[in-house]
């Protein structure tokens, strides 16, 4: 799998999309996980609704939301109030049994807020030693959620 780069601005929301073959992955729940090290495990952040038929319902875990358009074949992950520590390598996954197929590898980059004059030294970018061959960059033009748009926190 090639790695797709999504760039977002600190403090704003970043939307990551993962397209997939809707028939190949029919009936399968999806998940968003964070890669721990280059060869390490992928730690589950959030997964779609336990009932596949309700996968269109947005599920939150902290500041990360997931929703699945199972007919169109697009998994969408929203990272709200993006922070420097959110930068890193993630995966969109299709679940079957206890196993997971990788739909897309995603590198999240957090850019400094141009309106924020604080030190941007802690913002993370992949170093030269970290090579993401054939990485495709998708710039995500985001804005902060308005007060009325803030979704309810997860109930469980």
């Amino acid at each position: 799998h090639n790695t797709t780069v999504f760039q977002g601005v600190a403090g704003q929301s970043l939307q990551v999309s993962c397209p997939y073959d809707s028939m190949k992955h029919w009936g399968r729940r999806k998940a968003w996980c964070r890669q721990l090290g280059e060869k390490g495990p992928c730690q589950r952040v959030v997964s779609t609704h336990n009932l596949w038929l309700l996968s269109f319902l947005r599920r939150w875990n902290g500041s990360t939301a997931i929703t699945d358009d199972t007919l169109g074949g697009t998994l969408t992950i929203t990272l709200r109030n993006l922070q420097p520590h959110d930068a890193g390598l993630y995966q969109c996954q299709s679940l079957h049994g206890s196993e997971a197929d990788t739909l897309r590898k995603v590198l999240v980059e957090v850019l400094a807020d141009p309106l924020d004059h604080r030190d941007a030294g802690d913002l993370w970018f992949p170093g030269e030693s970290e090579s993401f061959e054939d990485a495709h960059v998708e710039h995500s033009i985001s804005r902060s959620l308005l007060e009325g748009e803030i979704p309810f926190p997860p109930t469980s």
């Epitope: 073959d21 079957h96 196993e99």
Partner: antibody, heavy 123, light 107 residues
């Protein structure tokens, strides 16, 4: 009506090559995974591997990796299992089966099976 | 690989009897388990999936239960056409693995 129709019985000699087939009908062939399952005489069922005809994504059981090749031709709704050099121990009944994902639990089960192809390898 | 162990390997029973076959997985597989029936010279037929869901067209005398490592297939009242071999199969992970089979014979 969903059907998987397999090619006929084969008698081969050790070292010969063979390709058996499984033709799907009555459903969208490119939208379901097809598995191959071996059953040696009087024995149980062994999962060999699986293919998604839509894009030819293929996975093998470690026990069969390198021993057989699974392929598909979506234009004629047919999946294949082939050997480049048969051994006497390949003598078995081979079934193809459609794998269906049941959305209740997001896992896969074999809901339709071919009638089986008996392969006999003997000198 | 996950090992699936069925017991008994064979069982003799009469028409009308209640029969239970068990299947044990070498590790937890949640409810990702199927049961198949196979008659001599025929392909297996899916009876139960997700441990307890009855496949369309399968008589209600067949039922499945269990989760984790221990599962059962129950036939509440044996019919003549039920004499066959039954296999369990885990759908937790690849490679998919089957139990060795339980042959149900007429007493």
């Amino acid at each position: 009506e969903v059907q998987l129709v397999q090619s006929g019985a084969e008698v081969k000699k050790p070292g010969e090559s063979l390709k058996i087939s499984c033709k799907g009908s009555g459903y969208s062939f490119t939208s379901y995974w097809i598995a191959w399952v071996r059953q040696m005489p009087g024995k149980g069922l062994e999962w060999m591997g699986i293919i998604y005809p839509g894009d030819s994504d293929t996975r093998y059981s470690p026990s069969f990796q390198g021993q057989v090749t699974i392929s598909a031709d979506k234009s004629i709704s047919t999946a294949y299992l082939q050997w480049s050099s048969l051994k006497a121990s390949d003598t078995a009944m081979y079934f193809c089966a459609r794998q269906r994902t049941f959305y209740y639990d997001s896992s896969d089960y074999f809901d339709y099976w071919g009638q089986g192809t008996l392969v006999t390898v003997s000198s | 690989d996950i090992q699936m162990t069925q017991s008994p390997s064979s069982v003799s029973a009469s028409v009308g009897d209640r029969v239970t076959i068990t299947c044990r997985a070498s590790q937890g597989i949640s409810s990702w388990l199927a049961w198949y029936q196979q008659k001599p010279g025929k392909a297996p037929k899916l009876l139960i999936y997700a441990a307890s869901s009855l496949q369309n067209g399968v008589p209600s005398r067949f039922s499945g239960s269990g989760s984790g490592t221990d599962f059962t297939l129950t036939i509440s009242s044996l019919q003549p056409e039920d004499f066959a071999t039954y296999f369990c199969q885990q759908a937790d992970s690849e490679p998919r693995t089957f139990g060795q089979g339980t042959k149900l014979e007429i007493k």
